[in-house]
């Protein structure tokens, strides 16, 4: 699941390496289908602009790529698959791509971090579940380690 | 909405002098029932451990804060609300103040990123809409633009 | 290693033309984005242009738009720089640069190859 | 477009010292900020991008930090072949140069 990660996947060694071949993968794949997309563009205003690539470099990073690969897969190539079955398979191929780059994205989740769950919280969660009653007793109890949790959060992020 | 920021907003200059006000009222609110939930609370074992506050610190830290405000807003004060008009009205208080620490966070949006939107994204879309059968040749004919921007996203988080 | 060697330098006279190509070795080309930096004499630098992988996007500073051409050959390893309508502000020793990705960064460099645009 | 200030704009230090450039932009960059060093008749090289992590081949002595639109390149103990010009370099929203900070022997 997206909260599930190893300390491997955490720190993510072998990624760098294998970043500019997902890519690659990516181009090719897209490449099969440019040429029929190009021809059917009759306009020559630009739907992804610059303002897209300074929030992808910007604090909004993460929620941006993750929203456009959504975007990509849920809302643009279904529409686009409806252009023949030779098409529907290369955007078949191209949406699968994107789908393995998210999957490792997750997987080494610093690079996707909007999209995974805090293991912890989900423990607290369970075990407050569990206990019932006494689960709201002791969540209220413990409410001041909650705040200085938000102030540890609170200092990393100043520095920045 | 969440996406909305101004670049004020964004550099949030103000913010740092706040922040040990609002950490402060948060505790003065909290010490209002903290005797009386620390009666309650019978058991010995800890539910908001080490590794929540772990995750503060790390990557996770914008999901866990975000997570647990609304852990404690939505499904622990309610239930705590059931112990009498008093303890109500101190909860209430003490809702509002997480609230309003919530609100700020996002306004100052580097705090809680994982909160906001691309407003980049939310315009993509948009367009995207207006321009019907257009928009679906024009955000394909575009994919390479969008790996250049997944690219320049991968090279900036390389950093870590 | 990765090298990057600039020509096509010269003097060249304002209104007139000229053709820059940097010659990339050691990395695979295609895999690449490039762009051209200048320097003028004694001054600090100032990006001109860039270009994709693919050479499917082109992008330049507002002052040599529509006078300068960036281009690449991925079969010959080459990057190019065609300079037209030139001006006495155009003088500049022009640096060949590799991309670390699209948008970021400059992470090699060319020694550079000098234009002087004087009548 | 984005400006770009360094500081100083030249300084004089010896061997072994610890030197410490900034460089401001107009607005915020995040982390979009690299630095590079240019000697007489050579071309920039490369000493840190994404305003922290070290180019590889690159002396530990040399280290940046900053976030925003506050960026800092360290020295920390100044070697002989460290004389030269240093820039900065935004490339959150198109390309810009700072103006450069001159380095010279005391």
């Known amino acids: 699941s997206r909260g599930q990660y190893s300390r491997e996947d955490n720190n993510c060694t072998h990624f760098p390496v294998g970043q500019s071949h997902m890519l690659l993968e990516l181009r090719t794949a897209f490449s099969q289908v440019k040429t029929f997309f190009q021809t059917k563009d009759q306009l020559d205003n630009i739907l992804l602009t610059d303002s897209l690539m300074q929030d992808f470099k910007g604090y909004l990073g993460c929620q941006a790529l993750s929203e456009m690969i959504q975007f990509y897969l849920v809302e643009v190539m279904p529409q686009a698959e409806k252009h023949g079955p030779e098409i529907k398979e290369h955007l078949n191929s191209l949406g699968e791509k994107l789908k393995t780059l998210r999957m490792r994205l997750r997987r080494c989740h610093r690079f996707l971090p909007c999209e995974n769950k805090s293991k912890a919280v989900e423990q607290v969660k369970s075990d407050f579940n569990k206990l019932q009653d006494q689960g709201v007793y002791k969540a209220m109890n413990e409410f001041d380690i909650f705040i200085n949790c938000i102030e540890a959060y609170m200092m990393i992020k100043m520095k920045s | 909405s969440r996406g909305q920021y101004s670049r004020e907003d964004n550099n949030c200059t103000h913010f740092p002098v706040g922040q040990s006000h609002m950490l402060l009222e948060l505790r003065t609110a909290f010490s209002q029932v903290k005797t009386f939930f620390q009666t309650k609370d019978q058991l010995d074992n800890i539910l908001l451990t080490d590794s929540l506050m772990q995750d503060f610190k790390g990557y996770l830290g914008c999901q866990a804060l975000s997570e647990m405000i609304q852990f404690y807003l939505v499904e622990v004060m309610p239930q705590a609300e059931k112990h009498g008009p008093e303890i109500k009205e101190h909860l209430n208080s003490l809702g509002e103040k997480l609230k309003t620490l919530r609100m700020r966070l996002r306004r100052c949006h580097r705090f809680l990123p994982c909160e906001n939107k691309s407003k980049a994204v939310e315009q993509v879309k948009s367009d995207f809409n207006k321009l019907q059968d257009q928009g679906v040749y024009k955000a394909m004919n575009e994919f390479d633009i969008f790996i250049n921007c997944i690219e320049a996203y991968m090279m900036i988080k390389m950093k870590s | 290693q990765v090298q990057l060697v600039e020509s096509g330098g010269g003097v060249v006279q304002p209104g007139r033309s000229l053709r820059l190509s940097c010659a990339a070795s050691g990395f695979t080309f295609s895999d690449y984005h490039m762009a051209w930096v200048r320097q003028a004499p004694g001054k600090g630098l100032e990006w001109v242009a860039s270009i994709t992988l693919d050479a499917t996007y082109t992008y330049y500073r507002d002052s040599v738009r529509g006078r300068f051409t960036i281009s690449r050959d991925n079969s010959k390893n080459t990057l190019y720089l065609q300079m037209n309508s030139l001006r006495a502000e155009d003088t500049a020793v022009y640096y060949c640069?590799?991309?670390?990705?699209?948008?970021?960064?400059?992470?090699?460099w060319g020694q550079g190859t000098l234009v002087t645009v004087s009548s | 477009d984005i400006q770009m200030t360094q500081s100083p704009s030249s300084l004089s230090a010896s061997v072994g010292d610890r030197v410490t450039i900034t460089c401001k932009t107009s607005q915020n960059i995040f982390e979009n900020l690299a630095w590079y060093q240019q000697k007489p008749g050579k071309a920039p090289k490369l000493l840190i991008y994404?305003?922290?992590p070290l180019q590889a081949g690159v002396p530990s002595r040399f280290s940046g930090s900053g976030s925003g639109t506050d960026f800092t390149l360290t020295i920390s103990s100044l070697q002989p072949e460290d004389f030269a010009t240093y820039y900065c370099?935004?490339?959150?929203?198109?390309?810009?140069f700072g103006p450069g900070t001159k380095l010279e022997l005391k």
């Open positions: 994404n305003a922290s």
């Open positions: 370099h935004q490339y959150y929203s198109g390309y810009t």
């Open positions: 640069a590799r991309h670390r990705g699209f948008s970021v960064w400059l992470d090699y």
